[in-house]
Structure formats: C-alpha cells, structure tokens
C-alpha cells in the first residue's frame, strides 16, 4: 500500500477520505486505527456502526468521527480540533470477522496555524530517510510520501 499524506492546520478540522471497491467490501464494517511504531499494531480509534446498513451514521470517539458511504465506496474520517499529537501514521480498514484489510495507509501532518504566533516547535514534520519507498501524490490538503520520507519521527 502507498501512503497518502493528509495535511491539516492545528486547531482546525481535517477530513480524510479512503476510497474502496464497494462491491468487494460489501457488508463489511470499517475502522480507523493508529499505527503504533513502524511495525507495531494498529490501535483502533473508531469504527463504523455495528449494523452495516447504518454505516452512514457518523460515529465519534473523542474528536475523531467516521462515516461510510457503502454504495459509493468512500470512508470518511474527520479529525476535529487537530492537535500536534494527532500527527502520525493511520490506516483505514475493512473488517471481516477477526481480520482487517487495509484500505489505505494515511500519514497525518499537522501544520502550524499561521495566525497562531506561539512556538511551533512541538509540531512534528516527517524527517528525511532513505528507507521509505511507497510514494504517490494525491491532493485535497493531502499528498503522498516523497521518496526518502519516513512516516515516524526519528527517536533519540
């Protein structure tokens, strides 16, 4: 899977879209999870309604919402009041029994609010590395990782 980058401004809302084949994933609930480390598990943040027919209903977990257009094949996640700690690697998933298929890998970047003159030192941007290869560009305040970028901040 390529990783698509979605950029949002701190304090504002960011909408992430994950297109999928609605016929292939018929009847399947979806989920949004956060990747813990480069090879770690993906921790569930929020999932769609327990009844697939009601997947269009927005479900919230804290400041994160999820809604699914099951016929059109688009899963939409909204991150409200985006904060620096929201930056990182996520996945859109299609759930099937105990399995989860990855629909899209998403890197969320948090940009400093241009109107906020406080120290932006705690905002994280991906650093340079030669290890990350999957890259393609897709805009809507989003892009894909450039070759050489890594989805996790370097650890000291």
């Amino acid at each position: 899977h390529n990783t698509t980058v979605f950029q949002g401004v701190a304090g504002q809302s960011l909408q992430v879209s994950c297109p999928y084949d609605s016929m292939k994933h018929w009847g399947r609930r979806k989920a949004w999870c956060r990747q813990l480390g480069e090879k770690g598990p993906c921790q569930r943040v929020v999932s769609t309604h327990n009844l697939w027919l009601l997947s269009f209903l927005r479900r919230w977990n804290g400041s994160t919402a999820i809604t699914d257009d099951t016929l059109g094949g688009t899963l939409t996640i909204t991150l409200r009041n985006l904060q620096p700690h929201d930056a990182g690697l996520y996945q859109c998933q299609s759930l099937h029994g105990s399995e989860a298929d990855t629909l899209r890998k998403v890197l969320v970047e948090v940009l400093a609010d241009p109107l906020d003159h406080r120290d932006a030192g705690d905002l994280w941007f991906p650093g340079e590395s030669e290890s990350f290869e999957d890259a393609h560009v897709e805009h809507s305040i989003s892009r894909s990782l450039l070759e050489g970028e890594i989805p996790f901040p370097p650890t000291s």
Epitope: D21, M23, K24, G27, W52, L53, H96, E99
Partner: antibody, heavy 122, light 107 residues
C-alpha cells in the same frame, strides 16, 4: 441468464498438473467473489478458497493453502483452480460458486457451477 | 477457523412430517449463516441466508432461525423433493466453513 459453466471431467495420473475453469456470464464478473468448493466422493462440502476477479485478491482455507492455486482472468470472465502435482486424494467433485450480495450486507453462494469431476489414479 | 457442527447426521422422516435440523458454531457468527440443499448428482442450492431469509424461489415451508452459535433449519411439512442433504455455512469470517451436513431420508 446468470450462470457459471465449468470445464469438463478430468482423469489424471498422480504427479500431473491440472487447471480447471469456471466461466461466468450474465452478470458483472469482476464485481463478485468466486469461491471453490471440494466434495470428495460420498462426503460433505469443503470451502477451499475465494477470489475477487476485480483485483485478484485471493483467500485460501488453511487446509488448501499451498495445495492449490486460485486465479482469474477477468478479460474472459473466468476463474481457475489449479494443481501443480496431483495426488490420488485430490479425487473429488469441484464446484465454483458466486458469492452473492444480500441487502442486509451478508453474502452467500447464490449461483453454482455444475461441478467438475477430477479423478486421479495411476 | 470456525467449526460448524450439524446434527443429526441423518434424519429419517415420512412425507408430511416436520424436519428440524441443527447447526452449531464453535464461536459466534452473528446471523451470518446460510443453508444449502444438495440432491444426488446436483450442485448445492441456496435455501436460506442471514440465518432466516429465504433465497429467491424457495418455498415457504423452509424457514431458518437462530443467531450467535445456534441455528435451526425447519421444513414444516416434507415434500418428496425435500429428501436431500442439507449444509449450513458461515460467512462471518474466512474461511467460510461448511457444516458436515444432515441427510434427510425417507423413513
């Protein structure tokens, strides 16, 4: 008419390879999962695996993983089940079936092929 | 994988009698269960999906019930053409396993 038509009966020797087919018609072949089911003589149904012809995503039952290969050619609306080295224990009737979608979100094998009898004997 | 156990293995009944077939799952499959009928020399035919919904063209004498781990297929009054083997199958998770089957034979 929506249907799945399978290739004819096969008689093979142990160690030989084989590829049987299942051709779909009357519906959008790329938009439905196609499964394969084994039925050994006088026995029950065994779910072997499934393929989504739209992108060739394939899942196998652990019992059949590595024993068979499921593939599809969407340009001719055909799914395949193949063996690289047959064994006498592969003697069985093999069915392909379409995984139909239900309004509730569930799925079920709603259209079945007529079956392909494979006999492996020295 | 989810194991489906069908009982009884064989059911000997007369035409007009009521048939009750059971299918038990090793773990919950919610209502993601289907029933199929297979007659000798024929491919299986879908009877019931979603545990209780009749497939297109299936007579009303066939009904399904249950959810979670215990399911039942009932044939209210057996017709001569109903004597066959019946299989349950779960589509809750891969692999979509089948039960071992119940043969409904003429007494």
């Amino acid at each position: 008419e929506v249907q799945l038509v399978q290739s004819g009966a096969e008689v093979k020797k142990p160690g030989e390879s084989l590829k049987i087919s299942c051709k779909g018609s009357g519906y959008s072949f790329t938009s439905y999962w196609i499964g394969w089911v084994r039925q050994m003589p006088g026995k029950g149904l065994e779910w072997m695996g499934i393929i989504y012809p739209g992108d060739s995503d394939t899942r196998y039952s652990p019992s059949f993983q590595g024993q068979v290969t499921i593939s599809a050619d969407k340009s001719i609306s055909t799914a395949y089940l193949q063996w690289s080295s047959l064994k006498a224990s592969d003697t069985a009737m093999y069915y392909c079936a379409r995984l139909g979608r239900k309004p509730s979100g569930s799925v079920a094998f709603d259209i079945w092929g007529q079956g392909t009898m494979v006999t492996v004997s020295s | 994988e989810i194991v489906l156990t069908q009982s009884p293995a064989t059911l000997s009944l007369s035409p007009g009698e009521r048939a009750t077939l059971s299918c038990r799952a090793s773990q919950s499959v919610s209502s993601y269960l289907a029933w199929y009928q297979q007659k000798p020399g024929q491919a299986p035919r879908l009877l019931i999906y979603d545990a209780s919904n009749r497939a297109t063209g299936i007579p009303a004498r066939f009904s399904g019930s249950g959810s979670g781990t215990d399911f039942t297929l009932t044939i209210s009054s057996l017709e001569p053409e109903d004597f066959a083997v019946y299989y349950c199958q779960q589509d809750y998770s891969w692999p979509y396993t089948f039960g071992g089957g119940t043969k409904v034979e003429i007494k």
